[in-house]
Amino acid sequence: CKAMHVAQPAVVLASSRGIASFVCEYASPGKATEVRVTVLRQADSQVTEVCAATYMMGNELTFLDDSICTGTSSGNQVNLTIQGLRAMDTGLYICKVELMYPPPYYLGIGNGTQIYVIDPEPCPDSDF
């Protein structure tokens, strides 16, 4: 296993609709053919997998149909979007990148992006 540097923003604020986007960029010494990207959430010393996708370079990322993640790639940059976030989902979201093919296997883990989610205030009833 070879180490690889992965960069991601330190902080992102989710939109009022519970959508957060950030770029995960990996520094590889060459172009991989097959890449796996995993988003992990760390909160209260617990780490859980949020979503994962394997893609062929030059093709779109394909997450599972019921995944809360979508993404696109350009070169070594992966643009990740996480949807359906609520205040309770605030936490550190870590980008993990694996170069699956060709060998050797490279692994990189980012320092994490702190995503803050604020639930929108309910609209007050209005009389017309």
Epitope: S28, P29, G30, K31, A32, G75, L99, P102, P103, P104
Partner: antibody, heavy 119, light 107 residues
Framework: DVQLQESGPGLVKPSQSLSLTCSVT?????????WNWIRQFPGNKLEWMGH???????NYNPSLINRISITRDTSKNQFFLKLSSVTTEDTATYFC????????????WGQGTSVTVSS | DIQMTQSPSSLSASLGGKVTITCKAS??????IGWYQHKPGKGPRLLIY???TLQPGIPSRFSGSGSGRDYSLSIRNLEPEDIATYYC?????????FGSGTKLEIK
Amino acid sequence: DVQLQESGPGLVKPSQSLSLTCSVTGYSITSGFYWNWIRQFPGNKLEWMGHISHDGRNNYNPSLINRISITRDTSKNQFFLKLSSVTTEDTATYFCARHYGSSGAMDYWGQGTSVTVSS
Amino acid sequence: DIQMTQSPSSLSASLGGKVTITCKASQDIKKYIGWYQHKPGKGPRLLIYYTSTLQPGIPSRFSGSGSGRDYSLSIRNLEPEDIATYYCQQYDNLPLTFGSGTKLEIK
């Protein structure tokens, strides 16, 4: 530590074939990476010639496609360059090197071997 | 093929000083660039890959930057052992192509 070492004749006659060997120690050429030949002309210009992958697939520089062949002997952990129909323009220092991925930056190089094409 | 236009072809600087070498690609290479140091009688030595990532064992005096078509290598606190020829190389597409080289001399 990974080491690459080029070897072959230092003098080749025009119209003949140039054959060079790259011997690799410290890493199996079948375990990963792409194994390359690069040459440096007398004016210092570097030219990528081609490579062979860990699983034996080749890519060549289109400028050499009709004259070049890169092969390997996995039992000896060596790979080879054959350049046919050489001219004086092929006089250069020839390097072998490795890189990761289908295209990449070369992290290990041999020290190079000088080849002169002359009658 | 992607052309890599490297400049200057040579430069002279003082010990302890700083130099910057540039490479311009003929198209966007998406940060897929490496930089090498080459001394006579040896193979080139990889300094930096993916624009700015230092190869293990390379001193932090070396740094790289850029995006799109424009890239640069900087060397600060120049030392006598930095005397060499420096090359850029793109790895966005085959065939792999190199810059023409920059010969660094110390005043």
